[in-house]
């Protein structure tokens, strides 16, 4: 009789995961008896897969009915494959023995897993930034085989350049994570703003994985402040606004001080958006010049998403308007908020600081 | 190591069945042939039949065709034969033995059961 | 039905000398490239056990004093040099088709 072959001949095949891979192997002989046993890896540290007489292997099936009269069919059939079936394969002869004894290997199957990579997730700054400045955006999927990948960031729309990606491991593995951090220059128009990783792998059929951030979590638009005082509203009260437009996010307290004194503090909220995804807010305070004596300085000061106060202050004129008699009455003080404002043609008798 | 352990003596009437067990362990039992042969007193082997237990095929020999049924609890790695409408010349001891090599031969044996058919 | 007839039915050799037992089958065994001949050994109160498989080839843990030979419908068991301990009862059987044995033949000491 001829001398056994152990014939396995597929070098190598691929499986996506979660199907199946059947992995061929037949032998030439009928002799010696004795049980096929499958190993992934060679050497000592090899793992068993599959005995054919003996032990539990759920996942692994013969192809062929063992018990068939003349069986030389030892192919194996690995059910829900994972990356971490990934390895060569093979298919042992052993004779019969106490314990069996090996007799002849076949060459070896590999087994590659293609994985698809996880959905990209996009994380910002931990700290908003102003327009002008640069923040760093990272992208990470993990879990994807082969190592071949492509990313690409966008920023609405528009491929940026000034990006740099990693794959890992370098070396070979049963799977493979990207991380790929972007550098992104920050306008005040980027309040709607979005940036997009997009991740190409051979797993997804060209339909690539997108993850996103909005720009909203990372910026900082400060407000621009002016105070104006408006027409009289009545004898002695004199109606000043304090005008806070163009900031982003909304968390934003106002307070009015009068010489110096805190008069009224309030908080931004509920406000309704600028077309730019900015806000604006208007106050106002009413001042009544007759409990004065002397000039009042009006401060407007604004403290924005927890950065340091900007004031913006106006000097109301008591001289310029005469007191009324009997009057105790020292200020009052209203506030609204207001979505436009409207620039007052009567602006005679403030002072810019 | 491969164990095939068989249930004990049996004496029975004529007419009567008997059925005789055979629990395996060593191995998967599920991938082996399971073949019943006996021995009477002081003569050679003779093959009943044979069992696959992944799914209950079986061939019999013509002689036990009528008579002997195989089968097999796959829960508790145990093969059966029961042989019906016994006779004295039934008298042998049963054994069981596994076909390693799917080559119908027969590579492990069990110690054998005695049935006796006496009146 | 395939027919195994063994000869000698008995025979008597002495300790270190060859013995050899004949299987002639009543139609060739030879399938697939094999020949379907298997041998045993049976002592006196125990099961056979499996000495040659597929005509020439010795099972695992048997001397290599055993050896088998023979194609098609004749074949042979060989005892290089008898020991002792070879004194049974040695059976052919043949799978070309459902198992069958042969009668036995005895095997004893001159």
């Known amino acids: 009789e001829e001398e056994l072959q152990v014939i396995q001949p597929e070098k190598s095949v691929s499986v996506a995961a979660g199907d199946s891979a059947t992995l061929n192997c037949t032998v030439t002989s009928l002799i010696p008896v004795g049980p096929i046993q499958w190993f992934r890896g060679a050497g000592p540290g090899r793992e068993l897969i599959y005995h054919q007489k003996e032990g539990h292997f759920p996942r692994v099936t013969s192809v062929s009915e063992s018990t068939k009269r003349n069986n030389m069919d030892f192919s194996i059939h690995i059910s829900n494959i994972t990356p971490a079936d990934a390895g060569t394969y093979y298919c042992v002869k052993f004779r019969k023995g106490s314990p069996d004894v090996e007799v002849k290997s076949g060459a070896g199957t590999e087994l590659s897993v293609r994985a698809k990579p996880s959905a990209p997730v996009v994380s910002g700054p931990a700290v908003r930034a102003t327009a002008e400045h640069t923040v760093s955006f990272t992208c990470e999927s993990h879990g994807f085989s082969p190592r071949d990948i492509t990313l690409k960031w966008f920023k609405n729309g528009n491929e940026l350049s000034d990006f740099q990606t990693n794959v890992d491991p370098a070396g070979k593995s049963v799977s493979y994570s990207i991380r790929s951090t972007a550098r992104v220059v920050l306008t005040r128009r980027d309040v709607h703003s979005q940036v997009i990783c997009e991740v190409a792998h051979v797993t997804l059929q060209g339909d690539p994985l997108r993850g996103t951030a909005n720009l909203s979590e990372a910026i900082r638009v400060p407000p621009f402040l002016e105070v104006t005082q408006q027409s009289m509203r009545a004898d002695n009260q004199v109606n000043v606004t304090c005008q806070v437009t163009k900031f982003y996010p909304q968390r934003l307290q106002l307070t009015w001080l009068e010489n110096g004194n805190v008069s009224r503090t309030e908080m931004a909220s509920a406000l309704p958006e600028n077309k730019d995804g900015t806000y604006n807010w208007t106050s106002w305070l009413l001042v009544n010049v007759s409990a004065h004596r002397d000039d009042v300085k009006l401060t407007c000061q604004v403290e924005h998403d927890g950065q340091p106060a900007v004031n913006k202050s106006f000097s109301v004129k008591v001289s310029a308007h005469p007191k009324e008699q009997g009057s105790n009455t020292a200020a009052e003080n209203t506030g609204t908020n207001e979505r436009d404002y409207k620039d007052d043609d009567d602006k005679h008798h403030h002072h810019h600081h | 190591q491969v164990q095939l352990v068989q249930s004990g003596a049996e004496v029975k009437k004529p007419g009567a069945s008997v059925k005789v067990s055979c629990k395996a362990s060593?191995?998967?039992?599920?991938?082996?042939?399971i073949n019943w042969v006996r021995q009477a007193p002081g003569q050679g082997l003779e093959w009943i039949a044979m069992?696959?237990?992944?799914?209950?095929?079986?061939h019999y020999n013509q002689i036990f065709k009528d008579r002997a049924t195989l089968t097999t609890d796959t829960s508790t790695s145990t093969a059966y034969m029961e042989l019906r409408s016994l006779r004295s010349d039934d008298t042998a001891v049963y054994y069981c033995?596994?076909?390693?090599?799917?080559?119908?031969?027969?590579?492990?044996w069990g110690r054998g059961t005695l049935v006796t058919v006496s009146s | 039905d395939i027919v195994l007839t063994q000869s000698p039915d008995s025979l008597a050799v002495s300790l270190g000398e060859r013995a050899t037992i004949n299987c002639r089958a009543s139609?060739?065994?030879?399938?697939?490239?094999?020949?379907?001949i298997f041998w045993y050994q049976q002592k006196p109160g125990q099961p056979p056990k499996l000495l040659i498989y597929?005509?020439?080839n010795r099972d695992s843990g048997v001397p290599d004093r055993f050896s088998g030979s023979g194609s098609g419908t004749d074949f042979t068991l060989t005892i290089s040099s008898l020991q002792a301990e070879d004194v049974a009862v040695y059976y052919c059987?043949?799978?070309?088709?459902?198992?069958?044995f042969g009668q036995g033949t005895k095997l004893e000491i001159k």
């Open positions: 033995a596994m076909d390693y090599g799917s080559l119908y031969a027969m590579d492990y």
């Open positions: 597929l005509a020439s």
């Open positions: 139609q060739s065994v030879r399938s697939s490239g094999y020949n379907w």
């Open positions: 060593g191995y998967t039992f599920t991938n082996y042939w």
């Open positions: 069992i696959d237990p992944s799914d209950s095929e079986t």
């Open positions: 059987q043949e799978s070309r088709e459902l198992p069958t």
